[in-house]
């Protein structure tokens, strides 16, 4: 049988010796030897390592800078980084969420298809026939035109994607 040419899954090779990696949340202080174990130390406050590793320094937790519109969504641990998100009304400019921009509003004639979140912008859609939006908003969907018939009225002015229909009384002469 062939002898192994590599170490086991959670090990690394150094000086012909297979040493245990340090577990998440810990950094390497000293490699193992033939006679000693790998020495690992927990990461300090505001530091983390999220994988089995042989790093000699832990990574700093991300700082959620309020001057950039950021706030902490999830506090970091020794094994995970801090997750930032944006203040209300703002969203991240990238997946890493390093800065924020104001949510866009949907112009008249467009309605909100999907409301913005801390990580995604507003998605707008044109109001289809039978619907309208007469405001610029980050929340309002397209509204259906008023149904004049259900009010026993008639359409006096047709609706557009920006305006509602105008209803009026029925022409009595037609009776």
């Amino acid at each position: 049988p062939e002898p192994p040419t590599a170490c086991r899954e959670k090990q690394y090779l150094i000086n012909s010796q297979c040493c245990s990696l340090c577990q998440p949340g810990q950094k390497l202080v000293s490699d193992c030897t033939e006679f000693t174990e790998t020495e690992c130390l927990p990461c300090g406050e505001s530091e983390f390592l999220d994988t089995w590793n042989r790093e000699t320094h832990c990574h700093q937790h991300k700082y959620c800078d309020p001057n950039l519109g950021l706030r902490v969504q999830q506090k970091g641990t020794s094994e995970t980084d801090t997750i930032c998100t944006c203040e209300e009304g703002w969203h991240c400019t990238s997946e890493a969420c390093e800065s924020c921009v104001l949510h866009r509003s949907c112009s008249p004639g467009f309605g909100v298809k999907q409301i913005a979140t801390g990580v995604s912008d507003t998605i707008c859609e044109p109001c289809p026939v039978g619907f309208f939006s007469n405001v610029s908003s980050a929340f309002e969907k397209c509204h259906p035109w008023t149904s004049c018939e259900t009010k026993d009225l008639v359409v006096q002015q047709a609706g557009t994607n920006k305006t509602d229909v105008v209803c009026g009384p029925q022409d009595r002469l037609r009776a």
Epitope: P3, K10, T38
Partner: antibody, heavy 121, light 111 residues
Amino acid sequence: QVQLVQSGTEVKKPGASVKVSCKASGYTFPGYYMHWVRQAPGQGLEWMGWINPDSGGTKYTQKFQGRVTLTRDASVSTAYIDLNRLRSDDTAVYYCARERCRTTNCYLDYWGQGSLVTVSS
Amino acid sequence: QSALTQPASVSGSPGQSITISCTGTSSDVGNYNLVSWYQQHPGKAPKLMIYEVNRRPSGVSNRFSGSKSGNTASLTISGLQAEDEAEYYCCSYAGRDTFVVFGGGTKLTVL
């Protein structure tokens, strides 16, 4: 320092099952495979299998396939061996032993104190 | 039936040297430096004495040494002492997925 501490003596009837534990300390438990070796009274050492404490993957020698189950609970750094359908010739001292590897070779560097399992009607 | 053959017993007087042999095949002992040796006192767990043919773990006396010639590995104990009286097992690593084959054991008696 590395220590493997095993559970105590067990007396079982033929056909029963037994579970022996091996608690590890002094090293990173998921980083090293754990092996199980048994020794019948007055006999030599017999390798049974290994477990990868990280993934739970196992390898058994043909003789014990189907009758032995190796498990672990990484949260308490403990490995277990379950032997079922016990027979009188399963009477033995069961040892856990940690595997250490170099580039071309692996060997068992630390052993538990052993757990005596007696199978008798 | 062990794949590695050891003599059932050897003996020697204090101060003497003894050698325990372990014979395998060209695919295990002969091919690679895969042999380790374990000492076992009665009622105790085995203890690693030699690995990779001739390497000694920390704390093991330099009176213990290992060697290999062809398909036979050997454990030599020099300056024999009473506490060396024990059972000795050779062991061959048989590949990453099968791992271990033990010899039948050799009882060392210090006269």
